[in-house]
Amino acid sequence: QKKDSTPNTTEKAPLKGGNCSEDLFCTLKSTPSKKSWAYLQVSKHLNNTKLSWNEDGTIHGLIYQDGNLIVQFPGLYFIVCQLQFLVQCSNHSVDLTLQLLINSKIKKQTLVTVCESGVQSKNIYQNLSQFLLHYLQVNSTISVRVDNFQYVDTNTFPLDNVLSVFLYSSSD
Amino acid sequence: QKKDSTPNTTEKAPLKGGNCSEDLFCTLKSTPSKKSWAYLQVSKHLNNTKLSWNEDGTIHGLIYQDGNLIVQFPGLYFIVCQLQFLVQCSNHSVDLTLQLLINSKIKKQTLVTVCESGVQSKNIYQNLSQFLLHYLQVNSTISVRVDNFQYVDTNTFPLDNVLSVFLYSSSD
Amino acid sequence: QKKDSTPNTTEKAPLKGGNCSEDLFCTLKSTPSKKSWAYLQVSKHLNNTKLSWNEDGTIHGLIYQDGNLIVQFPGLYFIVCQLQFLVQCSNHSVDLTLQLLINSKIKKQTLVTVCESGVQSKNIYQNLSQFLLHYLQVNSTISVRVDNFQYVDTNTFPLDNVLSVFLYSSSD
C-alpha cells in the first residue's frame, strides 16, 4: 500500500507494529498517512441477491473477491453504496432494498417503496444509498445485498451503481 | 493552502515536489496534512442545466469559476452533491436528474421519477444526492448538471442545494 | 482522545496549543492524526421533533448529551444522518423532513413527499439522508430534527436510523 503523503520512499507495505522509538522518519512514514480505499461499479450481469462488482475498479489497501471487499488494515472505515433502480410499475407496489453486510451480516439497510399508486407506468426510476461508519478487523468482509436484483439498472446506468469504501482512522 | 494541522508555520502553499531528504520539518510540513475542500450552495437564480454556485461558500485548496470547481492538488477526492426539488405535479410523471461531471463528462448520475400517479397535487418535494470517489489531476474540473433546473428549489431551500468536495488522499 | 496513528504513546489528550518549535516528536504527535468521530443509532422511543440517540453508540472525541453531539476539538466536520421512515398512506400526502441543526439552528434539510397519489396503501417505506460539511468550534452542538417523528421506523429498522460525524480537518 503506497502511503500517498510520504515522499521519497518506495516501500509498498506500511510498517506494521515495530517500535520506531526515536527514529523519526520511521514514525513519520509508518503511521500518519495510511490510506485504504475502493470504488467499485456493479457487474453488468447480476444473478444473485448478493451483488458482484467489476474487478477493474479503483482499489487500494483492500482485496476484492467473490462479491466481497476484504479488509487488509484494521481501522474505522466509511462505507457508502448507491444503486440506481428501474421498475416497470404494474398494479402493485414494490419495495426496493439496499443492505450493507459486514462478514455476511446485515449492518444497515435502506428500504423504499415505489409504484405506490398502483398505476401502470412506463418506467419508474429510483435511487437508493446507504452508508456505514464501522470498525473493521483484518479479513473482515464488506458486501451488498438487494432483494430484487432484477431492478438494479445496469443497462442505462452502468457507472452509477457503486460501492465505495475508505479508511478514516487506522488502528495499527 | 494552509495546512491545518501544522502549527508554527505561516507559508500558505504546500511544498510541492522537492526532496526533503533528511529535513524532517520539511517532510512533516509538506505532506501529511494536506487538505482541500469545498462546500458550495447553489445560486439563487438558475438558467442553465449546468448549475452555478455561490462564490461565497467555504472553499480551500480549490478554485471556483463559472460553475466549475478546479482542482489545485492532485489526489483522490470525495465529491458529494445534494439537491432539493419542488415539483407541481400535473397529469404526467417527471424524471429528476443529478449528474456529477468531471472535465465536462458525466461520471455519475441519479435519476428519480416523481408524480408517478398522474394525480394533480399542490407540491411534491423530492431530494436527490450523488457521490463520487475519483482521482483528479491539477486543473480537473468538477461540475453538476440537472435536466430540469426549474425544479431545483432555490426559494424555500436556499441552503440545501449543495456541492461538497474533500481531498481524501494527496498524491504529490 | 487517543491519537490513533501515533504509536508508543499513552497520553490520552492531544497537545493543544503550545509551541513545539524544533521538538519533532512533539509536532508529530500533537497534530497530524487528530481524529474525532461518532456513529449513533436513534432511540427506540421518540417523543420529540428533536431526535434522541442511543448513548451506547460509537463515539470518540465528542460528547453525547440530551440529543446533542457536543464538539470537543475545533475543526471541519463531515456530518451525515440517514433515517428510515414507514408511513401508512391514507388519502393525503405527507412531507417527511430530516434537518441537521448546529447550535439548535437548521443548517441543512431534506424534504420528501410520500403518499402523493392519495391511494390508501398498506405500508410505504421511504429513506432520507442529509450531510453537512461544517466548521465547528469547541462546545458547538449537532442535533437532528424531524417534523413527523411518529413515522421514523424504530421497530423494523432499529439499526438503520443513524447520525454519524467525523472530523475531516483539525484546526488547533
Epitope: - | - | 401508512q88 391514507s90 412531507d95 439552528k105 417534523d147
Partner: antibody, heavy 120, light 107 residues
Framework: EVKLQQSGDELVRPGASVKMSCKAS????????MHWVKQSPGQGLEWIGS????????SYNQKFKGKATLTADKSSNTAYMELSRLTSEDSAVYYC?????????????WGQGVMVTVSS | DIQMTQSPSSMSASLGDTVTINCLAS??????LSWYQQKPGKSPKLMIY???NLEDGVPSRFSGSGSGSDYSLTINSLGYDDEGIYHC?????????FGSGTKLEIK
C-alpha cells in the same frame, strides 16, 4: 370534512378530576398528532402536550406533567385529556387541535373548546 | 423554552388601514411559525403557516413575513371581519409556545 368534536363544558369541585374528549372525523385519526391547548380567561394560549395515536406516544409541557394525562382510543377515533387535582388555576377553555402533515403546517383544525370551571 | 414576544398587545385601526403585528422568538425557529385569528367565544383559526404561507380560504389581504427569530403579520385594507385576537405560535421545538396575543379593534 375534517371535524374535531369536543365534549361538553364542565363544572367541577377543587381537588376533583375531569376527563374530556375530542372525537375526530373526516380524516385518518392515526395519521396526525393531536395537541391540547389551554386558554385561561383573558389570557393567551398555552400548549399542554400532544399524543400520536399511531405510536401511542405522548409529549408534555413540563408545566402540565402530573396535571394532564393524554390518551387516545384508535377504535373510536377519540383523544382524551384528564386533568387531576383541580384548582381554580385550572379554570380555562381547553382545545384539542390537529397538527398538519405537510411541510411547515401548523394547527389546521381545532375543536370548539371545553370550558372547565373549578368552583366549590 | 422558546419565548414568543408579541407586540403590540392591543391596537386600534380604521377600516381600510394596513396593520402589522410582530412576533419575536427568543431563538431561530426556522419559519416554524403560524398566525391564528380568534374571535370572542370561538376557537383559533389558522391564517398563516410556515411564516409566509396563506392557509386555504384566507383572504390575500393577510400576509406573513420574516425569518430566523423575527416575524410579522400584515393585514391590508382592514375590514370589520378582521377584528379579534391574533396569536403567533412556534412549533419548531417542544414545548410549543405562543405569543401573548394582540387584540385588534376596528375604529
Amino acid at each position: 370534512e375534517v371535524k374535531l368534536q369536543q365534549s361538553g363544558d364542565e363544572l367541577v369541585r377543587p381537588g376533583a378530576s375531569v376527563k374530556m374528549s375530542c372525537k375526530a372525523s373526516g380524516y385518518t385519526f392515526t395519521d396526525y398528532a393531536m395537541h391540547w391547548v389551554k386558554q385561561s380567561p383573558g389570557q393567551g394560549l398555552e400548549w399542554i402536550g400532544s399524543i400520536i395515536p399511531l405510536i401511542d406516544t405522548t409529549s408534555y409541557n413540563q408545566k402540565f406533567k402530573g396535571k394532564a394525562t393524554l390518551t387516545a382510543d384508535k377504535s373510536s377515533n377519540t383523544a382524551y385529556m384528564e386533568l387531576s387535582r383541580l384548582t381554580s388555576e385550572d379554570s380555562a377553555v381547553y382545545y384539542c387541535a390537529r397538527l398538519g402533515s405537510r411541510y411547515l403546517e401548523g394547527f389546521d383544525y381545532w375543536g370548539q373548546g371545553v370550558m372547565v370551571t373549578v368552583s366549590s | 423554552d422558546i419565548q414568543m414576544t408579541q407586540s403590540p398587545s392591543s391596537m386600534s385601526a380604521s377600516l381600510g388601514d394596513t396593520v402589522t403585528i410582530n412576533c419575536l422568538a427568543s431563538q431561530d425557529i426556522g419559519n416554524y411559525l403560524s398566525w391564528y385569528q380568534q374571535k370572542p367565544g370561538k376557537s383559533p383559526k389558522l391564517m398563516i403557516y410556515g411564516a409566509t404561507n396563506l392557509e386555504d380560504g384566507v383572504p390575500s389581504r393577510f400576509s406573513g413575513s420574516g425569518s430566523g427569530s423575527d416575524y410579522s403579520l400584515t393585514i391590508n385594507s382592514l375590514g370589520y371581519d378582521d377584528e379579534g385576537i391574533y396569536h403567533c405560535h412556534q412549533y419548531y421545538e417542544y414545548p410549543l409556545t405562543f405569543g401573548s396575543g394582540t387584540k385588534l379593534e376596528i375604529k
